[in-house]
């Protein structure tokens, strides 16, 4: 497979990963069909500092990231490990609520105005943020 | 000038397989998701498979999945649709066009003129 | 899946005449919505993505606008070689796309 060693176009760098920010919504499903299309995932949160980064670029306004817990446990799309990993919750967060009157609970975690996460219907049209890393092989399978 | 060029088309009874290429030129074929698009005689345009630029990921329209298989070989700038158990409503053109992202936002703003497929004993 | 409705399905006009073509989505699409032009034998042409945004090399005769569900197409007057079918394409489900059903214009 090959390596990608610089952004590309319309992604901003940081940290050895890019980034791309939406300037539109989707629904959590879309949005992580969408970077997966890009050979990206929804952004994984692993530090404080990744956080601020993230959250200057999107300012207040719900932003999908790749956290969920459609299955169970919550899960992070790139397989970081949840339980031992970063959390900026907001106070008795997350909560399940039922009370929204959609159906179901709310197994999808976003970015609040404030930049602490909260989890909410899956399905809110919410902007996101697709995240690659830098010289990580890429997934392309062998040729036949 | 940026060009897509399918092949493969052809006259298969049903049941039977079938293998489409799209030959891309003039393009960094690799940073782009590629899709498939079909019309069926007098019918309009129906979306088929996509697949991410690595290869990586892939997606079908529930009327294939399963029997279709889409692939791509960047060193050869090209993209496959492998075809199977083929039937008779998988009669149509088919294209191959280019997924433009960012600020497209899903748009596919390069198509080749399609092939034929035609299912019929 | 979003149902993508157009109409009419076909129209005849005369060259340049002002055309208006409508789609409507199932749901709420905000403006995740294509135009293409088909014509047989010839390979399909974005002509407006993002419900209002003009692709490069497409003449400003051509427009989009709408957003939410009710989206339109407007050529403002119609030449010779926009004789075709047109077909939106809602690309809020990514990456299930789906397609108006087309209009055909064709010539009076």
């Known amino acids: 497979g090959s390596e990608r060693t610089c952004c590309p176009v319309n992604w901003v760098e940081h940290e050895r990963s890019c980034y791309w920010f939406s300037r539109s919504g989707k629904a959590w499903a879309d949005a992580d069909n969408y970077c997966r299309l890009e050979d990206a995932h929804l952004v994984v949160v692993t530090s404080w500092e990744e956080q601020k980064f993230v959250q200057h670029h999107i300012g207040p306004v719900n932003t999908w990231m790749g956290l969920h817990d459609q299955n169970g446990p919550w899960k992070w799309v790139d397989g970081t490990d949840y339980e031992t990993g970063f959390k900026n919750w907001r106070p008795e967060q997350p909560d399940d609520w039922y009370g929204h009157g959609l159906g179901g609970g709310e197994d999808c975690a976003h970015f609040t105005d404030d930049g602490r996460w909260n989890d909410d219907v899956c399905q809110r049209p919410y902007r996101w943020v697709c995240e690659t890393e830098l010289d990580k092989a890429s997934q392309e399978p062998p040729l036949l | 000038e940026v060009q897509l060029l399918e092949s493969g088309g052809g006259l298969v009874q049903p049941g039977g397989s079938l293998r489409l290429s799209c030959a891309a030129s003039?393009?960094?074929?690799?940073?782009?998701?590629m899709s498939w698009v079909r019309q069926a005689p007098g019918k309009g345009l129906e979306w088929v498979s996509v697949i991410s630029g690595s290869g990586g990921s892939t997606y079908y329209a529930d009327s294939v999945k399963g029997r279709f298989t889409i692939s791509r070989d960047n060193s050869k700038n090209t993209l496959y649709l492998q075809m199977n158990s083929l039937r008779a409503e998988d009669t149509a053109v088919y294209y191959c066009?280019?997924?433009?992202?960012?600020?497209?936002?899903?748009?596919?703003?390069?198509w080749g003129q399609g092939t034929m497929v035609t299912v019929s004993s | 899946d979003i149902q993508m409705t157009q109409s009419p399905s076909s129209l005849s006009a005369s060259v340049g005449d002002r055309v208006t073509i409508t789609c409507r989505a199932s749901?709420?699409?905000?403006?995740?919505l294509n135009w293409y032009q088909l014509k047989p034998g010839k390979a399909p042409k974005l002509l407006i993505y993002?419900?209002?945004s003009l692709q490069s090399g497409v003449p400003s005769r051509f427009s989009g606008s709408g957003s939410g569900t009710d989206f339109t197409l407007t050529i403002s007057s119609l030449q010779p070689e926009d004789f075709a079918t047109y077909y939106c394409q809602q690309s809020y489900n990514t990456p299930t796309w789906t397609f108006g059903q087309g209009t055909k214009v064709e010539i009076k």
């Open positions: 003039e393009f960094t074929f690799s940073t782009y998701a």
């Open positions: 993002t419900a209002s």
């Open positions: 066009a280019k997924r433009s992202s960012g600020w497209y936002e899903d748009a596919l703003d390069i």
């Open positions: 749901q709420n699409i905000s403006s995740y």
